[in-house]
């Protein structure tokens, strides 16, 4: 396990509707690892999200990171967000830790989609 996972893209762009409930999956991110088997298994996490609005869970079957809405968003309040995600191997033997100190990161631009209120009669 001397290869660390690296994101395919330095920037991901996702959109979320302001009507989306918490827990909604708003998109996926993906890293690649040149190792095989369990040495290629990875874990995604949030490195930076000052708004604490999003979370990332790992799909261990596809090795994708799934970006999840943790708090409802409001277009009028904030119509875009930026979060930084990181990825690390799930299994790293002690003797190979030196190869894995710097986790690969990516930036995610998230655009909030406006949902017009229906007119009140």
């Amino acid at each position: 396990n001397d290869n660390k996972p690296i994101f395919k893209e330095s920037l991901y762009r996702l959109t979320v509707s302001e009507s989306a409930p918490t827990g909604t999956s708003i998109g996926t991110i993906m890293a690649y690892d040149n190792d095989i088997g369990e040495n290629a298994e990875m874990d995604y996490s949030i490195e930076e999200d000052d708004s604490q609005t999003f979370d990332i869970i790992t799909n261990h079957e596809t090795q994708e990171g799934i970006v999840i809405l943790k708090k409802k968003v409001d277009f009028e309040h904030q119509n875009h967000y930026g979060i930084r995600a990181k990825v690390k191997n799930h299994h790293v033997p002690e003797q190979l830790m030196k190869y894995h100190t710097e986790a690969s990161t990516t930036f995610i631009k998230i655009q909030v989609e406006d949902v017009d209120e229906p007119p009140v009669f």
């Epitope: 762009r13 708004s51 309040h77 904030q78």
Partner: antibody
Framework: QVQLVESGGGVVQPGGSLRLSCAAS????????MHWVRQAPGKGLEWVAV????????YYADSVKGRFTISRDTSKNTLYLQMNSLRAEDTAVYYC????????????WGQGTLVSVSS | EIVLTQSPGTLSLSPGERATLSCRAS???????LAWYQQRPGQAPRLLIY???SRATGIPDRFSGSGSGTDFTLTISSLEPEDFAVYYC????????FGQGTKVEIK
């Protein structure tokens, strides 16, 4: 090097229409969100509209909503602003600007094109 | 809409002096999503600072930005002749709005 060149400005009567163009070069146009910003004579900057990198999302300032339309043609590396129902208060220099890749600030601007709405 | 108020309106200084420009937001600007631009007469604006404190490519280190929440500052440590211009702050926390500008003029 990155270059943005606006054209299409001119004098138009109130209620008239005009289409501005912004020719982009020196970067991968299809990877960047693009904006229009205007500046009335002797005044400050006012954001007008944005279009996403792939053209699927557009947003407008309230002052132009329903009258202006932003669009882009990736095959021509060109950004457009269709302005209808023009008013005297739309008189300004119109700049196109590129949004930073990892941010939402504007890292490159064109030289601007002047639109005068007058009878 | 987040309203940005810049002060002072005009700053009269001599080359070599330190300039301190202020930008106050009507509500908190998330994630320090604030930029500063310089506009010389007859020219387009130029990005100086983004993220409240990060210098844009090619910007001299005499320009620095600081602040968070609702109060932000642009400092020019020692004014050069080419620095006399109008400076705008911009927030991009929610949509995009600009301050009304501060003119830095030669005393």
């Amino acid at each position: 090097q990155v270059q943005l060149v606006e054209s299409g400005g001119g004098v138009v009567q109130p209620g008239g229409s005009l289409r501005l163009s912004c020719a982009a070069s020196g970067f991968t146009f299809s990877s960047y969100d693009m904006h229009w910003v205007r500046q009335a004579p002797g005044k400050g900057l006012e954001w007008v509209a944005v279009i996403s990198y792939d053209g699927t999302n557009e947003y407008y300032a309230d002052s132009v909503k329903g009258r202006f339309t932003i669009s882009r043609d990736t095959s021509k590396n060109t950004l457009y602003l269709q302005m209808n129902s023009l008013r005297a208060e739309d008189t300004a220099v119109y700049y196109c600007a590129r949004e930073r890749y990892f941010d939402w600030s504007f890292d490159y601007w064109g030289q601007g094109t002047l639109v005068s709405v007058s009878s | 809409e987040i309203v940005l108020t810049q002060s002072p309106g005009t700053l009269s200084l001599s080359p070599g002096e330190r300039a301190t420009l202020s930008c106050r937001a009507s509500q908190s600007v998330s994630n320090t999503y604030l930029a500063w631009y310089q506009q010389r007469p007859g020219q387009a604006p130029r990005l100086l600072i983004y993220g409240a404190s990060s210098r844009a490519t090619g910007i001299p280190d005499r320009f620095s930005g600081s602040g968070s929440g609702t109060d932000f500052t642009l400092t020019i440590s020692s004014l050069e002749p080419e620095d006399f211009a109008v400076y705008y702050c911009q927030q991009y926390s929610n949509s995009w709005t600009f301050g009304q500008g501060t003119k830095v003029e030669i005393k």
